[in-house]
Interface confidence: low
């Protein structure tokens, strides 16, 4: 509204009239008049400091829009009616405090607040960084920011926080690696970080294991194992104890025998060897190395089964030049072996009794030449020959040819053989076999007692001319020594042989009856002795063991024996008493 113009009060007190000046103005009397002036913080609308014009207004000054703003840097200015108010921005403070207005004591000035001086401003395990008007928290190494907190980093969750063969140990804000037992750090330090060091295996195998053992170094450890044929004294297969010894195992003391039945076991340091008893040989399908060594019965002897017992024969087989003295002897031996080799050739070769028997004839033809050999050589030759004929006969049972010849008759030897099929189906049956003028009677009970496996067969053989070589000089009485001054001995029958497939060859319950034809009629003063060929002594000797005389006539002698053997009759004249 427009104020009315009034006449001035001539008395000099115009300002008593409050309407003379606008709002936010002061009125000042003068000698003859007055003037209006806007209050601090306001500005007249006509721009004059002093005015009387009733149309002039006092407008508020916005100090905060001035430049530079009155509160100074890092502050906020708030305009008020006729004045302004200063406050510091967040992160800043003034010594006067906030909400300062002009007129208040002190100077308003905003400076940065160092929030980092307050201990709780940042979470645990973090560092505080002050900045102008602010601050920041950063997690320390080994910690990670999660939901305004600093969480410990599990460095050990990283598969490569530590090298192989190390244990990772996480700690608050850190971690360390330790080599596992049996490993050492390449850095030489007990604990370390990262992959810069490695954990190297300590080789404990330099001196940890006892003699006769093998040391196996393993990552971080080792173990000892006794060599084959040795056993650890603590009974543990793999061991690390220092006090354990590896002791030789006597494999031969084990029961049942390591080598199996019918074997000979020989212990050695850390090992052993297997062999077979007489009459058995190693099974070709087994081996000691594989742990399945076994001995199988020799069904019929081959060269290698004959040789081991005789050094003289071995000399003929060594492959080196034979000594001159043995040339003739070895020729005879090799003649016999050439026949035996054919019989033994292989498992499937059939053996014809007729053909093989005839192959032995040339040997018998030359038998008269054996007299030039020493007694030992002669007995060795005889043993080889007799065993070879037996082998050939047994082989003919085991590997028969299609057309079996039950009897072979030649000038020099006869063989009659019988394969037992139904012949022994009835009780108390006896079988008679005839060769040359000699005869063998054997009971079926004896054949059964012989424990034959698979094929069962018996044979009887009679040799012509052999008695002249294997004569009385080879007689060795088991019961009493004989001296030639007291008695006279002479061979008075052909040499005969009983052959049977069974394993048992002697000690039969029922005797085998041999009827031997006398070469010369028996004289009244002569007494016959039934003898059998034994290989136990010096290559071979005649012995009276196991046979007794049943009957002696002028033309034949009947012997009763509890064994299958090669037999002959020796006539003794003089003072000879025998039970």
């Amino acid at each position: 509204h427009i104020r009315p113009t009034r006449k001035p009060n001539t008395k000099g007190n115009n300002c008593r009239d409050s309407t003379l000046c606008p709002a936010y103005a002061t009125c000042t009397n003068t000698v003859d008049s007055y003037y209006c002036a806007c209050k601090q913080g306001f500005l007249s609308s006509n721009g004059q400091n002093h005015f009387k014009d009733p149309g002039v207004r006092c407008k508020d000054i916005d100090e905060c829009s001035q430049s530079p703003q009155p509160c100074g840097p890092n502050s906020s200015c708030k305009n008020l009616s006729g004045r302004y108010k200063c406050s510091c921005l967040d992160g800043f403070s003034s010594p006067t405090g906030n909400d300062w207005v002009p007129g208040k004591p002190g100077n308003f000035s905003c400076t940065d607040i160092n929030e980092c001086l307050t201990s709780s401003v940042c979470p645990e395990h973090s560092d505080c960084v002050n900045s102008m008007g602010s601050y920041s928290c950063s997690c320390q190494v080994g910690f990670i920011s999660r939901n305004s907190t600093c969480e410990d980093v599990d460095e050990c969750a990283d598969p490569r926080a530590c090298p192989e063969h190390a244990t990772c140990n996480n700690t608050v804000g850190n971690y360390s690696c330790f080599c596992n037992p049996g490993f050492e750090s390449s850095s030489g330090h007990l604990s370390f970080q990262g992959l810069k060091a490695s954990c190297e295996d300590i080789d404990e195998c330099t001196e940890m294991c006892p003699i006769n053992s093998t040391c196996t170094n393993t990552p971080g450890s080792y173990f000892c194992t006794c060599h084959p044929g040795f056993a650890p004294s603590n009974g543990q297969l793999n061991f690390t104890d220092q006090g354990v010894e590896c002791r030789d195992i006597d494999e031969c003391r084990q029961d049942p025998s390591t080598c199996g039945p019918n074997s000979i076991c020989t212990n050695a340091l850390g090992s052993y060897s297997c062999g077979c008893i007489a009459g058995f040989h190693p099974n070709p399908e087994g081996s000691q190395k594989d742990g399945n060594f076994s001995c199988q019965r020799v069904l019929f002897k081959c060269k290698e089964d004959v040789i081991p017992d005789n050094k003289q024969i071995q000399q003929c087989q060594e492959g080196t030049a034979v000594k001159p003295a043995y040339v003739s002897f070895c020729a005879q031996i090799n003649n016999i072996f050439s026949v035996l080799d054919k019989v033994c050739e292989n498992k499937t070769t059939v053996v014809s009794l007729k053909n093989t028997t005839e192959s032995f004839v040339p040997v018998l033809k030359q038998i008269s030449t054996w007299t030039k050999f020493t007694k030992e050589e002669t007995s060795s030759l005889a043993t080889v020959f007799l065993e070879s004929v037996e082998s050939m006969t047994l082989a003919s049972f085991w590997k028969p040819s299609a057309n079996i010849t039950p009897a072979v008759r030649t000038e020099y030897l006869d063989i009659e053989s019988k394969v037992i099929n139904k012949e022994c189906s009835e009780e108390n049956v006896t079988l008679d076999l005839v060769a040359k003028g000699d005869k063998m009677k054997i009971g079926c009970s004896t054949i059964e007692e012989s424990e034959s496996t698979e094929t069962t067969g018996v044979a009887f053989v009679s040799f012509v001319g052999m008695e002249s070589v294997l004569n009385e000089r080879f007689f060795k009485d088991h019961q009493a020594p004989l001296t030639t001054s007291e008695i006279k001995l002479k061979m008075n029958s052909r040499v005969v042989g009983g052959i049977m497939t069974g394993e048992k060859k002697d000690g039969f319950s029922d005797p085998i009856i041999y009827t031997l034809e006398n070469i010369q009629p028996k004289q009244k003063f002569e007494r016959p002795i039934c003898v059998s060929w034994s290989t136990d002594v010096k290559g071979g000797r005649w012995t009276s063991f196991g046979c007794v005389i049943l009957e002696a006539s002028e033309t034949y002698t009947i012997c009763s024996c509890n064994q299958m053997a090669n037999l002959a009759v020796i006539m003794a004249s003089g003072e000879l008493t025998m039970d």
């Epitope: 997690c139 190494v141 080994g142 969750a157 598969p159 192989e164 244990t167 990262g194």
Partner: antibody, heavy 116, light 112 residues
């Protein structure tokens, strides 16, 4: 919070070089293994290189001798210097961290195109 | 290098049905520290891979419990008990036991 930001990708000619950066925030480089993994267009993921927390580095056979992984602890940044680039290096390159348990922090990837 | 073989390479599934992905490694993934570092990732279209399972059978934070991992040595399996539309993408197994780290070829899961 934890964040990985790759940069430095672009189009480059065969035989030339390029350096990729991976800015890490929220944790310290010396606490974790940092990996580069790439993905050729329309193909699967292929691991490229790693710098383990202890500083050891390993590379895929396909980049051995050409690429170098390094880090600047003060800048909290991992780099992949790629030299003698080939067409078969064209891929999106991701920066990834073995963070607690496997690659559970990945960047958004940066594209490298090797073309004449 | 360890070869990681995933099967199948493509897996169409009806929502609500279960799904199974096999991952076989050419060598054992047991680390000398006793842990097995076999992880499963999902890469959704246009995104970076995200961790689902770590150390064979542990679910990463924020991963729904319909995802589970199992296996040991060289044979591992990721199972989704009930597939949802948001599960589409390529699933990768990765081994972190041996350097170099190796990924499977990926199995693309799509909704029928």
């Amino acid at each position: 919070q934890v964040q990985l930001v790759e940069s430095g990708g672009g189009v480059v000619q065969p035989g030339r070089s390029l350096r990729l950066s991976c800015a890490v925030s929220g944790f310290s480089l010396t606490s974790f293994g940092m990996h580069w993994v790439r993905q050729a267009p329309g193909k699967g993921l292929e691991w490229v290189a790693v710098i383990w927390s202890g500083g050891s580095t390993y590379y895929a056979d396909s980049v051995k001798g050409r690429f170098t992984i390094s880090r600047d602890n003060s800048k909290n940044t991992v780099y992949l210097q790629m030299n003698s680039l080939r067409a078969e290096d064209t891929a999106v390159y991701y920066c990834a961290s073995i963070y607690y348990r496997g690659f559970d922090v990945w960047g958004q990837g940066t594209t490298v195109t090797v073309s004449s | 290098d360890i070869v990681m073989t995933q099967s199948p390479l493509s897996l169409p599934v009806t929502p609500g049905e279960p799904a199974s992905i096999s991952c076989r490694s050419s060598q054992s993934l047991v680390h000398s520290n006793g842990n097995t570092y076999l992880e499963w990732y999902l890469q959704k279209p246009g995104q970076s891979p995200q961790l689902l399972i770590y150390r064979v059978s542990n679910r990463a934070s924020g991963v729904p419990d319909r995802f589970s991992g199992s296996g040991s040595g060289t044979d591992f399996t990721l199972k989704i008990s009930r597939v949802e539309a948001e599960d589409v993408g390529v699933y990768y197994c990765v081994q972190g036991t041996h350097v170099p780290l190796t990924f499977g070829q990926g199995t693309r899961l799509e909704i029928k």
